[in-house]
């Protein structure tokens, strides 16, 4: 009935603010308009992200968290809406923004890439594994020679700053290594990486990038690959990679390369063993790699190949461990 009422006016929210609450994370907050009549009606809000990347959504709440790079600034608008089955009434927009941080674009880092690895934990008995993080980047083309870069990551609510850097010839940080982190790929949380910089000659523009832990996780190679030859058969066996994921979470790819004729046999497997027929005149190179599969998480990319094991002519009954 209200929607059909000519005089009914929807008023925009008030006190709309945007606040950076963490690396690459902002909190949008607003209040319902105190002058809004019929405040008992089921009001909603239409949020529009204008920059850095356009997005829009509806919410009943009066705050909203956004995870996005902030080095180009952030701008958003919000309006009050009232929906019915056949029409939507909307107020005017209110807008707010976070200004882009100072610095010339050419001074910020470029080509930021990050990868995570699962490694044995010597640190605490609670979990036998920990996740390391390595990030590399290129110095900005317009960055003065005295520029120094500093990297931070945020995963969930926790933020860590880098303590171990690799440097270029001018002593500028160009890579960072965290031996252990709190990163995991259990949920949908994104990894936020922030690199800021300092120089006596210019303002260095910071840079933010978001990564999916799933996409940057480098699965370890399968362990203890063993190969045995019996008559004209190759018996290949291996153990799951060093990983927090249990056995049933892995798919494997096996590569058997005939070094004599160049033929490559590839097998996709769920099991951790395989038998293959071979001739008795060729030498073979065997490698295995792994990928985490569903239902343990969304399928990830293939990990590194295990070291090649060579068997065959003049290498009968060879067993190698890696």
């Amino acid at each position: 009935d209200l929607l059909n009422h000519k005089k009914f006016l929807l008023l925009p929210p008030v006190n709309f603010t945007i606040k950076a609450t963490g690396l690459a994370q902002v909190l949008l907050h607003w209040d319902p308009n105190p002058d809004q009549e019929q405040r008992h009606v089921d009001l909603e809000y239409h949020v529009k992200i204008n920059a850095p990347q356009e997005d829009e959504y509806d919410t009943r709440k009066t705050e909203s968290k956004c995870v996005t790079p902030l080095h180009e600034g952030f701008a958003a608008s919000v309006r009050t809406i009232l929906k019915s089955s056949h029409t939507t009434l909307a107020s005017s927009w209110v807008s707010a923004e976070l200004k882009a941080p100072p610095g010339s674009p050419g001074t910020s880092v470029t080509n930021l890439t990050c990868t995570t690895h699962t490694v044995v934990s010597s640190h605490t008995h609670l979990r036998p594994y920990q996740v390391s993080l390595r990030c590399t980047w290129l110095v900005g083309k317009d960055a003065p020679e005295d520029t120094q870069y500093f990297l931070y990551y945020r995963f969930g609510v926790l933020t860590e700053k880098c303590q171990e850097y690799s440097r270029d010839a001018l002593n500028r940080n160009t890579a960072c290594w965290f031996p252990r982190t709190f990163i995991n790929s259990k949920g949908f949380e994104q990894l936020a990486v922030h690199i800021n910089g300092s120089s006596k000659r210019a303002a260095i523009k910071p840079f933010d990038q978001l990564f999916s832990p799933l996409a940057i996780d480098q699965v370890n190679p399968p362990r203890n690959v063993t190969v045995e030859i019996e008559s004209n058969s190759l018996y290949i066996q291996w153990e799951k990679p060093l990983s927090a994921f249990p056995d049933h979470c892995f798919n494997y790819e096996l590569k058997i390369y005939n070094t004599k004729n160049g033929h490559i046999q590839k097998e996709k497997l769920i099991a951790n063993k395989f038998i293959s027929k071979i001739d008795d005149v060729s030498t073979y190179s065997i490698q295995v790699r792994a990928a985490v599969s569903s239902p343990c998480r969304m399928p990830g990319r293939w990990g590194e190949w295990s070291q090649p094991i060579y068997v065959g002519k003049e290498r009968k009954s060879l067993v190698e461990w890696h």
């Epitope: 640190h123 605490t124 609670l126 969930g156 609510v157 926790l158 700053k161 303590q163 995991n184 259990k186």
Partner: antibody, heavy 117, light 106 residues
């Protein structure tokens, strides 16, 4: 692993108090540390957490701006500076070891802080 | 913030009985859940972490299970020394505890 909190005591509303926690039996700088409190006959409430080197600190909303967690890795000691105390802050305060997204695996014996006039 | 709802608030059980305590998270915590035991006048002790991993030195009659938002602690063959208050805790997004379950002997 041992965590030993300093004496608490009775403090008037609006006043300040600083708690300390001496750690031993492990490499202090290898762990995040936290303060957790428990009001009389009530449940447990996380108060604050600090990162390895003290560069990052996290607080529950009700203590933000009033409490400051800090650490001295050279002395293997954790601190909690509590300002503008109110009766709602009356509790046993525990210092606890953890490591980011981990549970609290070791706890101190706890120290009672009573805020009353 | 994630809210943890523990039930029951208190329970009485006989020696040798099996006890179950439930914990419900307000959102998925991806098994980032711990259980603690607290005896009167003592500090809490970690029993279970990552929903189902037993902490060193904890008797095997304690076990944890669950995933997503629903978790439980099971005590098989209740002993007199198990009389205590039990708390669940999530550590997926900050750190929040359930309200506790006071376990008494019948």
């Amino acid at each position: 692993v041992q965590l030993v909190e300093s004496d608490g005591g009775l403090v008037q509303p609006g006043r300040s108090l600083k708690l300390s926690c001496a750690a031993s039996g492990f490499t202090f700088s290898d762990f995040y540390m936290a303060w957790v409190r428990q009001a009389p006959t009530k449940g447990l409430e996380w108060v604050a957490t600090i990162s390895y080197d003290g560069s990052s600190a996290y607080y529950r909303d009700s203590v933000k701006g009033r409490f400051t967690i800090s650490r001295d890795n050279a002395k293997s000691t954790l601190y909690l500076q509590m300002d503008s105390l109110s009766s709602e802050d009356t509790a046993t305060y525990y210092c606890a070891r953890h490591d980011g997204y981990y549970p609290f695996d070791y706890w101190g014996q706890g120290v009672m802080v009573t805020v009353s006039s | 913030d994630i809210r943890m709802t523990q039930s029951p608030a208190s329970l009485s059980a006989s020696l040798g009985e099996t006890v179950n305590i439930e914990c419900l998270a307000s959102e998925d915590i991806y098994s980032d859940l711990a259980w603690y035991q607290q005896k009167p006048g003592k500090s809490p002790q970690l029993l279970i972490y990552d929903a189902n991993s037993l902490q060193n030195g904890v008797p095997s009659r304690f076990s944890g299970s669950g995933s997503g938002t629903q978790y439980s602690l099971k005590i098989n063959s209740l002993q007199s020394e198990d009389v205590a208050t039990y708390f669940c805790q999530q550590y997926n997004n900050y750190w929040t505890f359930g309200g506790g379950t006071k376990l008494e002997l019948k």
